[in-house]
């Protein structure tokens, strides 16, 4: 058993049929010594008496709010949550496996630049009685500070018969050094509580590996005289790290016909312009990637040829 926050405790349980559970000692936070009784949640049944109480916790019916009383007055509360371990593996019932980039990916994180700011998100089908708390650091043995905000519901989607809820959080490394080579990874830890169930999820990464630039901005076409060719130009996204001479991007320019089956013409360039042939009803799209490190491509920025 360990304390998650004031008066909230997590009991770690091996979860199998007829498991004996854990013996937990509860102490009433009071200077009183005598006449103390204990109840669980809203039950009128008295569980026991005394300043300390030893209880057996083996299922969710044993979790909840334990209250000590004296003469009708509430003295203190202890909320017990359960963290289940089945076959040596902690339960992951609350969050959905996103399966990208690999199985058992519950947290996904991205950064738009090297400033030390990043966003993580996760999915669940649970809509109520759900709370999240996020902590982060760089390194784990001698951790350096990363400050995370509150997790917020960022999207709702319908997936077949189920509704899916996306939560996200923004974090900022306290003393980020954008140009430095990373040697210790960022660690992100999410505590999830659904009703009386506790779970925790972690992710470990280097900022360089989760970089995904915003799409190029100000995408423009300039027809070339007496030609089917156009000059496509764009700019670095505002959110990308500066100076651009050091934090450089490379670009992919694509000409795509109206039909998805039509052949795509692609050009790769380090410049912020390219000359392509603009077919009727086609569109031109440009995306960006860090020039010196193969992290994710940005989403496409697009304009129609016409």
């Amino acid at each position: 058993i360990w304390e998650l926050k004031k008066d909230v405790y997590v009991v770690e349980l091996d979860w199998y049929p007829d498991a004996p559970g854990e013996m937990v000692v509860l102490t009433c936070d009071t200077p009183e010594e005598d006449g103390i009784t204990w109840t669980l949640d809203q039950s009128s049944e008295v569980l026991g008496s005394g300043k300390t109480l030893t209880i057996q916790v083996k299922e969710f019916g044993d979790a909840g709010q334990y209250t000590c009383h004296k003469g009708g007055e509430v003295l203190s509360h202890s909320l017990l949550l359960l963290h289940k371990k089945e076959d040596g593996i902690w339960s992951t019932d609350i969050l959905k496996d996103q399966k990208e980039p690999k199985n058992k990916t519950f947290l996904r994180c991205e950064a738009k630049n090297y400033s030390g700011r990043f966003t993580c998100w996760w999915l669940t089908t649970i809509s109520t009685d759900l709370t999240f708390s996020v902590k982060s650091s760089r390194g784990s043995s001698d951790p350096q500070g990363v400050t995370c905000g509150a997790a917020t519901l960022s999207a709702e989607r319908v997936r077949g018969d189920n509704k899916e809820y996306e939560y996200s959080v923004e974090c900022q490394e306290d003393s980020a050094c954008p140009a430095a080579e990373e040697s210790l990874p960022i660690e992100v830890m999410v505590d999830a509580v659904h009703k009386l169930k506790y779970e925790n999820y972690t992710s470990s990464f280097f900022i360089r590996d989760i970089i995904k630039p915003d799409p190029p901005k100000n995408l423009q076409l300039k027809p070339l005289k007496n030609s089917r060719q156009v000059e496509v130009s764009w700019e670095y996204p505002d959110t990308w790290s500066t100076p651009h001479s050091y934090f450089s991007l490379t670009f992919c320019v694509q000409v795509q016909g109206k039909s998805k089956r039509e052949k795509k013409d692609r050009v790769f360039t380090d410049k912020t312009s390219a000359t392509v042939i603009c077919r009727k009803n086609a569109s031109i799209s440009v995306r960006a990637q860090d020039r010196y490190y193969s992290s994710s491509w940005s989403e496409w920025a697009s304009v129609p040829c016409s």
């Epitope: 559970g21 009784t37 049944e45 008295v46 569980l47 026991g48 008496s49 209880i55 057996q56 916790v57 083996k58 299922e59 019916g61 044993d62």
Partner: nanobody, 114 residues
Framework: EVQLVESGGGLVQPGGSLRLSCAAS????????MYWVRQAPGKGLEWVST???????ASADSVKGRFTISRDNAKNTLYLQMNSLKPEDTALYYC????????RGQGTQVTVSS
Amino acid sequence: EVQLVESGGGLVQPGGSLRLSCAASGFTLSGSWMYWVRQAPGKGLEWVSTIKPNGSTASADSVKGRFTISRDNAKNTLYLQMNSLKPEDTALYYCARDFSGNQRGQGTQVTVSS
């Protein structure tokens, strides 16, 4: 009619063990909160241990790690396994359907003495 009949008490030396039984009739133990309480000579009733309908237990600090409450649903019987007995465990032991011991049996005497 609800009946609770305790048995298994006796005289035992310090450090010894006893197993108390409580045969219940007129109701099913498995759906009930059940308690062991005791009354030492010249003292009031003292709570010892509780078993909830789900089989989970609670016990007083004074008996922690020494006494174990359990039940056999098929026999509709409640038990108290008492190990490492001390002279201060000497008391009349009752099984009860309520914490205050209002609905209890006639009790079984446990005396711990050398």
